[in-house]
Interface confidence: low
């Protein structure tokens, strides 16, 4: 014969435990029902009556099966530099994340406590590492043969255009200016030929993913131990 199914509340076997979604009430010394998410324990169980659950009030929640006497308060409304990515409901807390162009400078268990605006790289500097949800943009000086003429949190250093005849040489913050004959950019995606004579012996490719800079235009090593870049003389 199958074992008799016990209904809450019931006394557990000596040394035994309560079942899933039940808890052991020390006062009643019985296994009692937990309340489902979105509810809380309005009346605790006794030896003869089970837990009485009630719905969470507005702006409060419980996310798990529980036997708390009061629901948790939802977090305060999102600040002006944040967007609400999860509303406060009876079953989940409000989650605030940083709006586009910002990153989380101080996180909390869920969402973000403090947002900060992504830094903008000024002319002569390009993005070495793009901003993420939790980290700021990292800028780098544009290496010889590359430039950035913008103040931007997304623009990388771009290669100077290659001229048949240069009218004004490029620098870190300005593209080269060619004479009236058309420039030759020779820019297959991901491959740029720097004007000579620019040594790229010790310059390594950027560790960040696309959009990629030209090989040899970054002063950053790939993150973590790695062999020298292909063609490096290692001097």
């Amino acid at each position: 014969l199958p074992a008799q199914v016990a209904f809450t509340p019931y006394a557990p076997e000596p040394g035994g435990t309560c079942r899933l979604r039940e808890y052991y009430d020390q006062t009643a010394q019985m296994c009692c029902s937990k309340c489902p998410p979105g509810q809380h324990a309005k009346v605790f169980c006794t030896k003869t009556s089970d837990t009485v659950c009630d719905s969470c009030e507005d702006s409060t929640y419980t996310q798990l099966w529980n036997w708390v006497p009061e629901c948790l308060s939802c977090g305060s409304r999102c600040s002006s530099d944040q967007v609400e990515t999860q509303a406060c409901t009876r079953e989940q807390n409000r989650i605030c994340t940083c709006r586009p162009g910002w990153y989380c400078a101080l996180s909390k268990q869920e969402g973000c406590r403090l947002c900060a605006q992504l830094r903008k790289c000024r002319p002569g500097f390009g993005v070495a590492r793009p901003g993420t949800e939790t980290s700021d943009v990292v800028c780098k000086p544009c290496a010889p043969g590359t430039f950035s003429n913008t103040t931007s949190s997304t623009d990388i250093c771009r290669p100077h255009q290659i001229c048949h005849v240069v009218a004004i040489p490029g620098n870190a913050s300005m593209d080269a200016v060619c004479t009236s004959t058309s420039p030759t950019r020779s820019m297959a995606p991901g491959a740029v030929h720097l004007p000579q004579p620019v040594s790229t012996r010790s310059q390594h490719t950027q560790p960040t993913p696309a959009p990629s800079t030209a090989p040899g235009t970054s002063f950053l090593l790939p993150v973590g131990p790695s062999p020298p870049a292909e063609g490096s003389t290692g001097d």
Epitope: R119, T132, C139, P141, P144, Q203, L220
Partner: antibody, heavy 119, light 106 residues
Framework: EVQLQESGPGLVQPSQSLSITCTVS????????VHWVRQSPGKGLEWLGL???????DYSAAFISRLSINKDNSKSQVFFKMNSLQADDTAIYYC?????????????WGQGTTVTVSS | EIVLTQSPALMSASPGEKVTMTCSAS?????MYWYQQKPRSSPKPWIY???NLASGVPARFSGSGSGTSYSLTISSMEAEDAATYYC?????????FGAGTKLEIK
Amino acid sequence: EVQLQESGPGLVQPSQSLSITCTVSGFSLTSYGVHWVRQSPGKGLEWLGLIWSDGSPDYSAAFISRLSINKDNSKSQVFFKMNSLQADDTAIYYCARNDDGGDYVMDYWGQGTTVTVSS
Amino acid sequence: EIVLTQSPALMSASPGEKVTMTCSASSSVSYMYWYQQKPRSSPKPWIYLTSNLASGVPARFSGSGSGTSYSLTISSMEAEDAATYYCQQWTSNPLTFGAGTKLEIK
């Protein structure tokens, strides 16, 4: 006020590892990187590596096999560890702040911690 | 790596004298940085991005240069300028320093 303070062991046995902690105040490690530079009479100022504000490290190729740099943003601490020390690693070790925003100057330095490698 | 060669290694100047020290790079760099260090002190940022004076640096200092040739100039030497000056580049890894120019007061 921006401050960086290195704390190290002073004396290290040959072939042992060196651990230094750089404790910072007056700024957040989520916005600034931290360099490690050493200075010895024989070699002058020598850059070892840095940890960026986003937590990723860059190492000098000369030290990449025996150096690790980590940090704990919440404790405002940067951790430097170098393995297999020899006598020529005797130097003053500095941590210095990097402005990840673009000036790229090491604008604040710690007072340095003197490390002697000797048995 | 990019090697920075500073010259002269040692120089002395009288108060009021114009001083120029140079830093030559083994290959082209985008910017040069200069640091001042006095005995028993940490290096201090002095000039950044080739020509910008760090906070608190007197206006008698200036920096210039491009490509592989850079210089630091003091228009009128003062006693407090006696120190060792290091150039530094970060166009490519590793970041490198020059061996320094020690400037003494006559």
